[in-house]
Interface confidence: low
């Protein structure tokens, strides 16, 4: 924004009524009236170019400084060419001197040269030569000087003539202000320009109605330069929640729109599943049955809990069950669906039921599942299991109802024993096995069946209550097919897979070397 000039003194506008003091009185400077461009103008003129040394002073009236710190002095003047005078006028000069003096009171007609300080020697860019002079063509020069900082209540200017032919047509003294300004939704008051060229006056702005300094943001400030120009804007105001920027003001969001926080963004239309908002809304309320999670942005549509998992299967595999399901048909409008699996076991004999989380093992933690399958192991045989899969999303916690599907499965067999070869010799094989501890109490005996590989006509059976057996009287360097099966009161359990174990050849005997 361009600087505003506040005029303290304007000789040309005063119509010759300022009554400046001349020294010596009645000599030197004289107030004259002339016509220029068909308009009467006043000027102070001196032209003592033939009279030797000159020391003529013209002093302005006392000028009240007011709030000015640095004043600017604009002079419009004309100077005749010394060569236009007969004989060149040896004592003629083509410059004059500008002075100032500060004071706290008006000295009136008491003029003292010693109180004045020289500002500069004023020289014309163009002098008025004879032809111009005769043609009434005034070569007007404009010179500007500045003085500051000023500290007293007022000041005088003075013009010293040292023998020139000069006419002062305009003396304008002013100071500069940075004008009242609206920028970045901040109002900056009219401010006096500083006095020192390198310095900038820092001015605090005031946020316009319904605008605020954003959290962590800088307060609006601008810098008022010496020339009255606003420079270096710092910080800004933003329209507060519920308001948006319209030109240089903050306007309330229209009905059906909202703005969540102080920002540069405009008001946004209320999202899906919200009620129409009133004017100046900071958010839009959810429709009945729809919710907003605490972490959901106000711009996100309102959502609801999901429906139950769409399809659930439980496939038993010995003492394991694989649960599989498909995502809910209605996600509730969210993508943060997770699943929780819970387990209940029932004893067929008594019909008693209870939770079974402690006794079973899941392939991954059963709460907060993102995948749609899980394997449950360590299930007890001859037990009925019911599995519940619940679907939840970010707003499920805001309602009491749950969305779940259940599947039941009966475990009729023990889990197949895990078999390993503990040792071997040329004529024997030492075999051990294990089943999950919850199932061991139901096992009566273990049945070990073995035969030579390739011989399908005969096989041998050994029964034991323990978890290992040594099979003797075997042929050397021969591969045997070995299977272990648990026997329960209710019948046979699941058999292990058939393992191939080979006895040692006579050359590499070494009893029971694995």
């Amino acid at each position: 924004a361009q600087g505003k000039e506040v005029v303290l003194l304007d000789f040309a506008a005063a119509g010759g009524e300022l009554g400046w003091l001349t020294h010596p009185y009645g000599k030197g400077w004289d107030l004259m009236q002339n016509i220029m461009n068909d308009m009467p103008i006043y000027m102070y003129s001196v032209c003592n170019v033939m009279s030797g040394d000159q020391d003529n002073w013209l002093r302005t009236n006392w000028v009240y400084r007011g709030e000015a710190e640095r004043i600017f002095i604009e002079l419009k003047f004309t100077v005749r060419d010394c060569n236009s005078f007969p004989g060149g006028a040896s004592s003629c000069k083509e410059t004059f001197n500008l002075y100032y003096a500060e004071s706290d009171l008006d000295y009136g007609t008491n003029f003292q040269k010693r109180l004045f300080t020289k500002i500069d020697t004023i020289a014309p860019d163009e002098i008025t030569v004879s032809s111009d002079f005769e043609a009434r063509h005034v070569k007007l020069n404009v010179e500007e000087r500045s003085v500051g900082p000023l500290t007293r209540k007022g000041f005088y200017l003075a013009f010293q003539d040292i023998g020139a032919c000069v006419a002062l047509l305009s003396v304008r003294v002013y100071y500069k202000k940075c004008p009242e300004l609206l920028q970045g939704l901040a109002h900056f008051p009219e401010t006096i320009a500083g006095s020192d060229a390198p310095s900038l006056a820092t001015v605090a702005g005031t946020c316009v109605d319904h605008a605020v300094v954003p959290p962590g943001g800088e307060e609006p400030r601008m810098h008022c330069a010496v020339d009255g120009e606003w420079l270096v804007p710092i910080g800004q105001c933003l329209c507060q929640a519920g308001y948006e920027k319209v030109e240089d003001a903050c306007q309330a969001c229209s009905p059906g729109f909202f703005k969540f926080e102080a920002s540069e963004s405009p008001c946004l239309e209320c999202p899906e599943h919200t009620l129409p908002s009133p004017e100046g809304a900071t958010s839009c309320e959810c429709e009945e049955g729809f919710f907003r999670a605490p972490q959901d942005p106000a711009s996100m549509p309102c959502t609801r809990p999901p429906s139950a998992p769409h399809y659930l299967t439980a496939v038993g595999m010995g003492a394991k069950v694989e649960l599989r399901w498909t995502p809910p048909q209605d996600s509730g409008g969210r993508e943060d669906i997770v699943y929780s699996v819970t387990c209940e076991q029932c004893w067929p004999e008594s019909g008693e039921c209870g939770p079974c989380e402690a006794s079973v093992r899941y392939s991954e933690p059963p709460h907060g599942l993102t995948r749609t399958s899980v394997t449950v192991s360590d299930l007890e045989p001859h037990m009925n299991y019911t599995f519940t899969v619940e679907a939840r999303n970010g707003v499920s916690g805001l309602v009491t109802s749950r969305s779940f599907r259940t599947a039941s499965v009966s475990i009729n067999q023990t889990e197949p024993p895990k078999v390993r070869l503990e040792g071997r010799s040329t004529t024997s094989l030492s075999v051990s096995w294990s089943i999950p501890p919850p199932q061991q109490s139901r096992v009566w005996k273990y049945e070990v069946t073995y035969r030579k590989k390739g011989d399908s006509n005969s096989y041998n059976v050994r029964r034991t209550e323990g978890f290992s057996v040594t099979l003797d009287d075997l042929a050397p360097d021969t591969t045997y097919l070995v299977q272990v099966q648990a026997l329960t009161q209710e019948g046979q359990g699941a058999g292990s897979k058939v393992h191939e174990f080979q006895t040692l050849s006579p050359e590499g005997s070494g009893n029971l070397a694995v």
């Epitope: 506040v6 007011g66 709030e67 009242e180 609206l182 009219e190 401010t191 006096i192 006056a201």
Partner: antibody
């Protein structure tokens, strides 16, 4: 000499409209912030509205916001106040007032303004 | 809005008396306070601006002081021309609120 002369007051029915004018002379009008201040009969002074030297920014008291509009024509040295949807409580003498920062001898102009020059006032009566 | 409260509401005094009027702001307004004088049927006249600065042409018996929330207008020696109502006004905020007025009447 600074002179401010208000006109346009009178009797008006509730819900009606009125336009006040303030003719300025004796100073450079375009340098002045101008304002309207009112005084209900037997009551104190209440600031109504202000307008910057070149026509902006404008501010309004909450009691008149949305009903009154302040404007100025610097070429005619005139200030205006358009008053719509008038109410009984708008009954008052309306003064035009002015402020020139050139006469405010402080390092930085105040956040708002005070009023150096006042007109003689014009009476607005809102009654049925 | 900033509330301005003047006290007293009415003040009876004699010519030559020293008179003090107080103005309190509901929040700090620095020194952005003006004082006006109003006579019946007349427009207000500016006396003091920026809490203590005397406006051009105002007699020196008027003076102002204070800053923040507490301000005073003092008439050092009451003159017959001074019987009037006096108002304070804050210009620290856009609302530019006035006090309710203090009437100085002849005792």
């Amino acid at each position: 000499e600074v002179q401010l002369l208000e006109s346009g007051g009178g009797l008006v029915q509730p819900g009606g409209s009125l336009r006040l004018s303030c003719a300025a002379s004796g100073f450079t009008f375009s340098h002045y912030m101008m304002a309207w201040v009112r005084q209900a009969p037997g009551k104190g002074l209440e600031w109504v509205s202000r307008i910057g030297p070149s026509g902006g920014p404008t501010h309004y008291a909450d009691s008149v916001k949305g009903r009154f509009t302040i404007s100025r024509d610097n070429s005619k040295n005139t200030l205006y106040l358009q008053m719509n949807s008038l109410r009984a409580e708008d009954t008052a003498v309306y003064y035009c007032a002015g402020y020139d920062s050139g006469y405010d001898y402080v390092a930085v102009a105040g956040p708002a303004e005070y009023f150096q020059h006042w007109g003689q006032g014009t009476l607005v009566t809102v009654s049925s | 809005d900033i509330q301005m409260t003047q006290s007293p509401s009415t003040l009876s005094a004699s010519v030559g008396d020293r008179v003090t009027i107080t103005c309190r702001a509901s929040q700090s307004i620095s020194t952005w306070l003006a004082w006006y004088q109003q006579k019946p049927g007349k427009a207000p006249k500016l006396l003091i601006y920026k809490a203590s600065n005397l406006h051009t042409g105002v007699p020196s018996r008027f003076s102002g002081s204070g800053s923040g929330t507490e301000f005073t207008l003092t008439i050092s020696s009451l003159q017959p021309d001074d019987f009037a109502t006096y108002y304070c006004q804050q210009y620290n905020s856009y609302s530019r609120t006035f006090g309710q007025g203090t009437k100085v009447e002849i005792k």
